[in-house]
């Protein structure tokens, strides 16, 4: 019988008492084969973290700073359940740390030196740790003691709880630096008042502070937020302009064998029986003998943290950067305006080899990082382990939902002004063998399908979106008799046709021979009835253009396109017979890397782009013998996006809507994780 006990860690006598009450009340409402609670008492949260890591306890609820400690080796804990606040309909699991300024003050984030600052309190998250952590490398040296460096950075501050004797500048705007509400500038409202009264130029608070203190929109309009990209936004645009997004209070568990499903089962049942307004005799979110015992008193319930979410992703790049800076205190030798090398994310061995070749030829401008799947690469870019990669539109959508931005677009048509003219897109098509003359768009049920990969534009999002509109369910593996859609569940019929060996079967990378455009077409040639690819795929792999044994004798005339009206047309008539227009592949990065990725890639394409005439004697960035490694092989240049610099603007309303509709069929664990952070 599996042990269904969750050992909860308590950090005080009062918590231990509440834990025992929790245990006893759960016993009375949950059947004997359900989850149960046991209580483990430790002296501190850090002791609880160590106990969970050592398998002496299973769970504890932590604030963000401690979630970071819990994640660090050797603890390796992960977030599993989040407390939410507000309503069930609009649950808030995060708050945003923001920098508020007056509208007419005219400076940006990178011009804070010499300004007057208002803080909620020394050592507090939104008011101190996050802003000072993010500004850390701009502080004058020596940076220790930190208070002295901060005092020398700003021209005056109010940082309640600071030592006014040793660091008088930190108390200049609020004499005495009192550490309670007796100090009018203490806490969130106090720091905002410090700004409002004109004592300070910037207040470091949380996003709700301004709404709680100014009910009137006209009054709020006198203020703006400073964004990390050195722009400003209105105060209600905090989701797009903040210093960090911070989880409020989170249950953590071991990453391996951490009982996360059991913990969720326990807490979900607990909130049903003892949540807000549920029971008089025991309340989960109430602490008669103290404050915030086990859980925050202000919590309204729990949400399961998606399993793909590790602590780094959960805390977010900005928060992790701020806390790491404060804890480790390391900065680059001298902050220069020069760009650091761009860390390119490469999928599997084939891409890594090409990336390494690029890295050597780039003379230090490009470095390479490996991952097994596109989603793993996106996650690495999010957390700073990598910086950039080029993605199909379907993954540009996921990357965008995860906070990344498009920076350059692949262009596929030769033109005089390639780099300045991003194209409208390419065509997603359905290809069949000419010999299968009875096959049409309307009778694909039961046929064998070949897809570039799950989640990609031409190979999945467009054809499956159209199919979904017709069949109104997500069971595509039942619609086709079998197929190869790399990235599907391994036991799915949509992995049956794939050719990868062993663990590589159906993997969404080049280790699966039927992956990508060329792979999907090969799948059609060798096994399938229909391939969902781009309009250039057939000509690029026929007429001897692809020397591989499976392709060298193929003829374009032996293939036809399926049109949505039920007719068929020759391959060259793609403009009048396609499934939809697809946005070109695009390079994505984090917002903080946007300028450097743009600059370095434009230099790189001038050195190794399609202006290189002899690829046998020189490195060519956009060539890889039809394997589309790092970039599509038919890329002519990487083009500026002009104002299409968000994923929505880049992909266009129609495509975003189409992918949004298909979201209910999504198997993307990363998309689920990212929409948890930003619904």
């Amino acid at each position: 019988v599996p042990d269904k006990t969750v050992r909860w860690c308590a950090v005080s006598e009062h918590e231990a008492t509440k834990c025992q009450s929790f245990r006893d009340h759960m016993k009375s409402v949950i059947p004997s084969d359900g989850p149960s609670v046991a209580c483990v008492k430790k002296a501190s949260y850090l002791d609880c973290i160590r106990a969970i890591a050592a398998n002496e306890a299973d769970a504890v609820t932590l604030d963000a700073g401690l979630v970071y400690d819990a994640y660090l080796a050797p603890n390796n804990l992960k977030p599993v359940v989040a407390e939410f606040y507000g309503s069930k309909e609009d649950p808030q699991t995060f708050y945003y740390a923001v920098a508020v300024v007056k509208k007419d003050s005219g400076f940006q984030m990178n011009q804070l030196r010499g300004k007057k600052s208002c803080h909620t309190g020394l050592g507090r998250s939104a008011g101190w740790n996050i802003p000072i952590g993010l500004l850390y490398c701009d502080l004058p040296e020596p940076r220790k003691p930190l208070e002295k460096a901060v005092a020398n950075f700003f021209s005056g501050s109010c940082a309640p709880c600071a030592d006014g004797t040793d660091f008088p500048q930190l108390c200049q705007l609020c004499p005495g630096c009192g550490c309670s509400t007796l100090n009018q500038y203490f806490g969130y409202s106090g720091a905002f008042k410090c700004l409002k009264d004109g004592a300070g130029d910037v207040a470091f608070v949380k996003h709700s502070t301004i709404f709680e203190n100014l009910a009137n929109k006209a009054d709020r309009d006198q203020y703006e937020l400073l964004c990390l990209d050195n722009t400003r936004k209105p105060v209600d645009e905090y989701k797009d302009c903040h210093l960090a997004q911070v989880p409020s209070h989170t249950v953590v568990a071991r990453s391996m064998g951490g009982k996360e499903d059991l913990i969720w089962e326990l807490l979900n049942q607990a909130q049903e029986h003892f949540g807000k307004d549920k029971s008089k005799e025991f309340q989960l979110f109430s602490s008669p003998h103290g404050k915030d015992l086990l859980f925050k008193d202000s919590a309204h319930g729990f949400l399961k943290v998606p399993p793909r979410m590790d602590a780094k992703m959960y805390l977010g790049y900005e928060y992790v950067t701020a806390i790491r800076n404060l804890r480790e205190g390391t900065c680059p030798e001298a902050p220069t305006d020069e760009c650091k090398p761009v860390k390119w994310c490469a999928l599997s061995h084939h891409e890594r080899l090409k990336c390494d070749e690029w890295s050597v030829n780039s003379v230090g401008k490009i470095e390479c990082v490996s991952a097994e799947t596109t989603e793993d690469c996106i996650a690495k870019i999010m957390n700073g382990e990598a910086d950039a990669m080029s993605l199909d539109g379907g993954f540009v959508y996921i990357a965008g939902k995860c906070g990344l931005v498009p920076v350059l677009a692949e262009n596929y048509n030769k033109s005089d002004n390639c780099e300045d003219t991003p194209e409208a897109g390419y065509f997603a098509i359905a290809v069949v063998k000419k010999s299968a003359s009875d096959l049409t768009w309307d009778n694909l049920k039961g046929k064998k399908s070949c897809h570039t990969a799950v989640g990609r534009t031409a190979g999945w999002n467009i054809p499956m979106g159209l199919l979904y509109n017709k069949i109104n369910h997500c069971r595509f593996d039942e619609f086709f008799s079998e197929g190869c859609a790399p990235g599907s569940k391994k036991d799915s019929s949509l992995c049956k046709l794939c050719m990868g060996s062993g663990l590589n079967l159906c993997e969404p990378n080049n280790k699966e021979g039927y992956y990508g455009y060329t792979g999907a077409f090969r799948c059609l040639v060798e096994k399938g009835d229909v391939a969902f690819v781009k309009h250039q795929t057939v000509p690029q792999n026929t007429g001897g253009k692809n020397p591989d044994p499976w392709a060298k004798n193929l003829n374009e005339k032996d293939y036809e396109l399926l049109c949505l009206d039920g007719t068929r047309k020759p391959v060259e008539e793609y403009a009048n017979c396609h499934l939809a227009r697809a946005p070109n592949h695009a390079v994505v990065t984090r917002k903080d890397k946007e300028a450097c990725v743009h600059k370095i890639l434009r230099q790189q394409q001038h050195l190794f782009g399609s202006n290189v005439t002899d690829c046998s004697g020189n490195f060519c960035l956009f060539r890889s013998e039809t394997k589309d490694l790092l970039f599509r092989d038919d890329t002519v240049c990487l083009a500026k996006l002009h104002d299409r610099n968000t994923y929505e603007k880049y992909l266009g309303e129609e495509y975003v809507k189409a992918v949004g509709n298909l979201r209910k069929c999504s198997t993307s664990s990363l998309l689920e994780a990212c929409t948890f952070r930003r619904p």
Epitope: D356, S359, V360, N361, V363, G364
Partner: nanobody, 112 residues
Framework: QVKLEESGGGLVQAGGSLRLSCVAS????????VIWYRQAPGKQRELVAL???????NYRESVKGRFTISRDDAKNTVWLQMNALEPEDTGVYYC??????FGQGTQVTVSS
């Protein structure tokens, strides 16, 4: 001006071994890394192995476990140790570093 010279090629039976060397004249050799390529008759030139200045190495899939690339910066030399050679390994082997043109290469022939 740095020049590269490859040597160590020859005719060998399948299963045999060869050690190729790439020697540079001039300074600043391989600061950014060195790549061994090969070209078989009528085929595209392909990357075989590379070594970066920090000692990081990578190989094309078909030679992994059989070939080893190494360097000695004091001797301005990069080696390619080739074991368990196969007929498919036949071709002219070249070494390359950024900004330096290809040398003459060294012919490797593996007979079955």
């Amino acid at each position: 001006q740095v020049k590269l010279e490859e040597s160590g090629g020859g005719l060998v039976q399948a299963g045999g071994s060869l050690r190729l060397s790439c020697v540079a004249s001039g300074s600043g050799f391989g600061v950014n890394g060195v790549i061994w390529y090969r070209q078989a008759p009528g085929k595209q030139r392909e990357l075989v192995a590379l070594i970066k200045s920090d000692g990081y190495t990578n190989y094309r899939e078909s030679v992994k476990g059989r070939f080893t690339i190494s360097r000695d910066d004091a001797k301005n030399t990069v080696w390619l140790q080739m074991n368990a050679l196969e007929p498919e390994d036949t071709g002219v082997y070249y070494c390359k570093t950024p900004g330096v043109p290809f040398g003459q290469g060294t012919q490797v022939t593996v007979s079955s």
